[in-house]
């Protein structure tokens, strides 16, 4: 489940978030059971992939999602697969790659005039705390620059970090994901041990800003391994 | 446009069970957060429970927790609300309400959009 | 859990007049809230996202400010279809919280 992630995950040792404290008191959260792997290496080796198991398409690189590999098959395995490419089907903005969105089935161009109009709605997983990110995650960038749609300020909803104001990443917030602002040297950070290894954070943090990355405080190098602080430090 | 229909409320009694659906239509369903909020008669509103846009995270307030269950199907376009052990506190209209989008104008945000609700009453 | 708390919880005034309602939240939930309009037997209606934000459809008489635990919805000159009830909506932490609302009735 969901909880077994976070408590196998270096979420669990954040202070509690601004939002709430660490158990999130006034919600149960669940997850579809036994396809959650953190501590999984996603990209093994590049003569040994492996398909990776998902629960929702955050668990998968820029260029992917997460989806049952057969038609119609059963939804509790999943994996990541690769995104697609413009003019190919889809079901939601998420199955579209970078620079493309699922309008009637199709991923389409997001750069095309028809962004103007009021189209065809977008994804959302989006609730709100700020206190949860994935290091470097939601770096999934670029859609065109020729974009017509207004970028998001912080706590409006998001699909890619690319929809979001400058200074701002987009983040999983609860159910959804919002844009949120990008850190700054000195805040707590989320590290990553590996690839993949951040299973379905309920909430994530941005990555640290330009010229910064997520260090283990000083002081804290003498702590156990589980409780290490990680902030965000001057290369 | 975007429409979201509640529907399955009624009289029910204490102890009883309901489930709400919510169908929606004018826009892809698969791509939203989804909720469902109450309004108890002449109180405010209260969050219920809320569902993540490919149904694998749920999320419920405590006064539900352990008697009422969220789920989606996404190629019926329908939001459900599976309500047992019913008290007579639940008593209530229950809208449900999806979230905005960043495509909006401007970009969306969280239950930005709700439906008309359906009335439940918890009376022996 | 956030509590929020709004006031005042009912106000009369006339048309035209200007109209503030306030919220404050029991800790900081930066600018995760929500301004919602709510007439009877009626939904709820988003009128302002993200504390500042107005939404499309909107009349421009309604804005709302602040961050933090603060935060303002103001109607700079009321209209007849303004009376209603209004409510603020927490979405920083879990589980996302209303205000108890403020009735703008007729005077």
């Known amino acids: 489940t969901l909880n077994s992630v976070l408590n196998s995950n270096a979420i669990k040792n954040l202070p509690p978030p601004l939002g709430g404290a660490a158990g999130h008191p006034g919600s149960a959260v669940s997850a579809a059971p036994g396809i959650l792997y953190p501590g999984g290496n996603k990209y093994q080796t590049i003569d040994n992939y492996q398909p990776y198991p998902c629960a929702e398409d955050e668990e998968c690189g820029t260029d992917e999602y997460c989806a049952s590999p057969t038609r119609g098959g059963d939804a509790g395995v999943q994996i990541c697969l690769a995104c697609r490419k413009r003019r190919k089907r889809c079901m939601r903005h998420a199955m579209c790659c970078p620079g493309n969105y699922c309008k009637n089935g199709i991923c389409v161009s997001s750069d095309q005039n028809h962004f103007r109009g009021e189209i065809e709605e977008t994804i959302t997983e989006s609730f709100g705390n700020d206190h949860s990110t994935l290091d470097g995650y939601s770096r999934r960038t670029t859609l065109s620059s020729k974009m017509y749609h207004t970028k998001g300020q912080e706590g409006s909803v998001c699909l890619r970090s690319s929809d979001c104001a400058s200074g701002l990443c987009c983040a999983r917030h609860f159910w959804s994901k919002i844009c949120k602002p990008v850190l700054k040297e000195g805040q707590v950070c989320t590290k990553h041990r590996r690839k993949g290894s951040h299973g379905l954070e309920i909430f994530q943090r941005c990555y640290c800003g330009e010229g910064l990355s997520c260090r283990i405080q000083k002081d804290h190098h003498q702590a156990s391994n589980s409780s290490r602080l990680h902030t965000c430090q001057r290369h | 446009q975007v429409q979201l229909v509640e529907s399955g409320g009624g009289l029910v009694q204490p102890g009883g069970s309901l489930r709400l659906s919510c169908a929606a239509s004018?826009?892809?369903?698969?791509?939203?957060?989804l909720h469902w909020v109450r309004q108890a008669p002449g109180k405010g509103l209260e969050w219920v429970s809320s569902?993540?846009?490919?149904?694998?995270?749920?999320y419920y307030a405590d006064s539900v927790k352990g008697r009422f269950t969220i789920s989606r199907d996404n190629s019926k376009n329908t939001l459900y609300l599976q309500m047992n052990s019913l008290r007579a506190e639940d008593t209530a209209v229950y809208y449900c309400?999806?979230?905005?989008?960043?495509?909006?104008?401007?970009?969306?945000?969280?239950?930005?959009?709700w439906g008309q609700g359906t009335l439940v009453t918890v009376s022996s | 859990d956030i509590q929020m708390t709004q006031s005042p919880s009912s106000l009369s005034a006339s048309v035209g007049d200007r109209v503030t309602i306030t919220c404050r939240a029991s800790?900081?939930?930066?600018?995760?809230l929500n301004w919602y309009q709510q007439k009877p037997g009626k939904a709820p209606k988003l009128l302002i996202g993200?504390?500042?934000s107005l939404q499309s459809g909107v009349p421009s008489r309604f804005s709302g400010s602040g961050s933090g635990t603060d935060f303002t919805l103001t109607i700079s000159s009321l209209q007849p279809e303004d009376f209603a009830t209004y409510y603020c909506?927490?979405?920083?932490?879990?589980?996302?919280?209303f205000g108890q609302g403020t009735k703008v009735e007729i005077k």
């Open positions: 309400a999806r979230d905005g989008s960043h495509m909006d104008k401007p970009p969306g945000y969280v239950f930005a959009f």
């Open positions: 004018g826009f892809t369903f698969s791509n939203y957060g």
């Open positions: 569902i993540s846009y490919y149904g694998s995270s749920t």
């Open positions: 800790q900081g939930i930066k600018n995760y």
């Open positions: 993200a504390a500042s």
């Open positions: 909506l927490q979405y920083y932490g879990m589980p996302p919280t």
